[in-house]
C-alpha cells in the first residue's frame, strides 16, 4: 500500500481542517488508514482522524482543531496499521479556505431595488470575521448567457442592485462565496443558491 498523491489540507480557520490524498489503488480508507495530527506546541496531545472514502483510491479526513492562530503548525502522519506511509506538516494559516456564507436572502420589496443579504460564516471573535470579502453570482435560469458576478469588497454582507439591471418577468438564482485577502485564501465553496422571480415596472416611455 502506497500513497500516490500526498495529503493536501485546507483549514476553515475556525475548527476544521480537511485533508485529501490518493492511494495507489482502491482503499477502504476508514478501516485501513489513520491520519495522525499533533499541534507543534508545548504538551499538545496527538489526535487520530478516521478518513472517509472520496472516490475509489481517494481519502478525505476532517481534522478537528481548537481555535486556530497564525503560528499554529501541525505534524501529520499517515498510518496503515503499524506502518508509517507518509509524514508531513501543515500550517493552517497558510492554507485557508473560508467557510461558505449562509442564509442568502433576496429582498424584492424595496422600490425596484434588489437587496441581497447573507450571513458572515464566522463569529465576531474570529479573525476572519472582519476580513472577508465576497463575490455574488447571479444567473438566469432561462438564459445561460445571462450570468454575472458582483464583487463585494466592503465588509457588510449585502448587495444592492437595481432590479432593472436584470430582465423582468423571469426567474433568477443567486449564490455567494467568500475569501480573505489577509491570508491569501482560496475562495470558499458557493453558498446554497436562492431563487426569485424578477419583476419590476418598466418606466413609461415618453413619446
Amino acid at each position: 500500500m502506497k500513497v500516490l498523491q500526498e495529503p493536501t489540507c485546507v483549514s476553515d480557520y475556525m475548527s476544521i481542517s480537511t485533508c485529501e490524498w490518493k492511494m495507489n489503488g482502491p482503499t477502504n480508507c476508514s478501516t485501513e488508514l489513520r491520519l495522525l495530527y499533533q499541534l507543534v506546541f508545548l504538551l499538545s496531545e496527538a489526535h487520530t482522524c478516521i478518513p472517509e472514502n472520496n472516490g475509489g483510491a481517494g481519502c478525505v479526513c476532517h481534522l478537528l482543531m481548537d481555535d486556530v492562530v497564525s503560528a499554529d503548525n501541525y505534524t501529520l502522519d499517515l498510518w496503515a496499521g503499524q506502518q508509517l506511509l507518509w509524514k508531513g506538516s501543515f500550517k493552517p494559516s497558510e492554507h485557508v479556505k473560508p467557510r461558505a456564507p449562509g442564509n442568502l436572502t433576496v429582498h424584492t420589496n424595496v422600490s425596484d431595488t434588489l437587496l441581497l443579504t447573507w450571513s458572515n460564516p464566522y463569529p465576531p471573535d474570529n479573525y476572519l470575521y472582519n476580513h472577508l470579502t465576497y463575490a455574488v453570482n447571479i444567473w438566469s435560469e432561462n438564459d445561460p448567457a445571462d450570468f454575472r458576478i458582483y464583487n463585494v469588497t466592503y465588509l457588510e454582507p449585502s448587495l444592492r442592485i437595481a432590479a432593472s439591471t436584470l430582465k423582468s418577468g423571469i426567474s433568477y438564482r443567486a449564490r455567494v462565496r467568500a475569501w480573505a485577502q489577509c491570508y491569501n485564501t482560496t475562495w470558499s465553496e458557493w453558498s446554497p443558491s436562492t431563487k426569485w422571480h424578477n419583476s419590476y415596472r418598466e418606466p413609461f416611455e415618453q413619446h
Epitope: F41, L42, L43, A46, L84
Partner: antibody, heavy 117, light 107 residues
C-alpha cells in the same frame, strides 16, 4: 554547546521550602520551554513543572499543583523552581531539562532534594 | 495516565553483544516515543525520538523500532561507554510518562 547547571538542593524538613535554580547556556534560552523533572529513589522519572519560552504559560501535574511554582528570568538565562509545603515523597534528584515540545532534549546533571525530619 | 512498562529491568552483557530493550505502552502510541540514556551521576541524554529517529551525534549502533504499543531499543554492538540505564517516554498524551528504566551492566 547546550549546558544546564542546577543548584539549590539540600536537606529540608517536611513542610519547609526550597528554591532550585538552573543556569542555562549555549542556546537561545527564551526560545525554548523549560522543565523540572525529578527522580525519586526507586521511582520513575516524572516531570513536575513546565514553563513556556516567554514564561506566560506554566504546567504542573496534580502531585505538586499548588505547592510548586516554576519561573524564569530570560534576561539572566535562568530557570527556577520554588517548592513549598515539602513532603517526604518530594525527596528526589531534580533535573532541569529543555523541552522540545513533547520530549526533553537536553538535561542538567541534577540536584538532590531530601525532605526529612 | 498511560503506563509504560520496560523489560528487562536490568541485564548483564559483554562488550560486542547485541542488546535489546523493550518498552510496552498501555495504549496505542503510534510512534510518539522517545528513548533516553543515563550514566551514573550524569545527565540523561536523548537518544531517539519518534520511535526510530536517531538524534544528532548519537552513534549508529543505537536504533529504535516498533509502533503502536510495542517498542524496542537495540544496541547492535555494545561498547564500554554504553553501560547505563535506558528509559522510554511516551508523548501521545499528557501527562507524558516514562518507563521504569533498564539498567545495562557489565557481565
Amino acid at each position: 554547546e547546550v549546558q544546564l547547571v542546577e543548584s539549590g538542593g539540600g536537606l529540608v524538613q517536611p513542610g519547609g521550602s526550597l528554591r532550585l535554580s538552573c543556569a542555562a547556556s549555549g542556546f537561545t534560552f527564551s526560545s525554548y520551554a523549560m522543565s523540572w523533572v525529578r527522580q525519586a529513589p526507586e521511582k520513575r522519572l516524572e516531570w513536575v513543572a513546565i514553563i513556556s519560552g516567554g514564561g506566560d504559560s506554566t504546567y504542573y501535574p496534580d502531585s505538586v499543583k499548588g505547592r510548586f511554582t516554576i519561573s524564569r528570568d530570560n534576561a539572566k538565562n535562568s530557570l527556577y523552581l520554588q517548592m513549598n509545603s515539602l513532603r517526604a515523597e518530594d525527596t528526589a534528584v531534580y533535573y532541569c531539562a529543555r523541552l522540545h515540545y513533547w520530549y526533553f532534549d537536553f538535561w542538567g546533571q541534577g540536584t538532590t532534594v531530601t525532605v526529612s525530619s | 495516565d498511560i503506563q509504560m512498562t520496560q523489560s528487562p529491568s536490568s541485564l548483564s552483557a559483554s562488550v560486542g553483544d547485541r542488546v535489546t530493550i523493550t518498552c510496552k505502552a498501555s495504549e496505542d502510541l503510534y510512534n510518539r516515543l522517545a528513548w533516553y540514556q543515563q550514566k551514573p551521576g550524569k545527565a540523561p541524554k536523548l537518544l531517539i525520538s519518534g520511535a526510530t529517529s536517531l538524534e544528532t551525534g548519537v552513534p549508529s549502533r543505537f536504533s529504535g523500532s516498533g509502533s503502536g504499543r510495542d517498542f524496542t531499543l537495540t544496541i547492535s554492538s555494545l561498547q564500554p561507554e554504553d553501560f547505563a540505564t535506558y528509559y522510554c517516554q511516551q508523548y501521545w498524551r499528557n501527562p507524558y510518562t516514562f518507563g521504569g528504566g533498564t539498567k545495562v551492566e557489565i557481565k
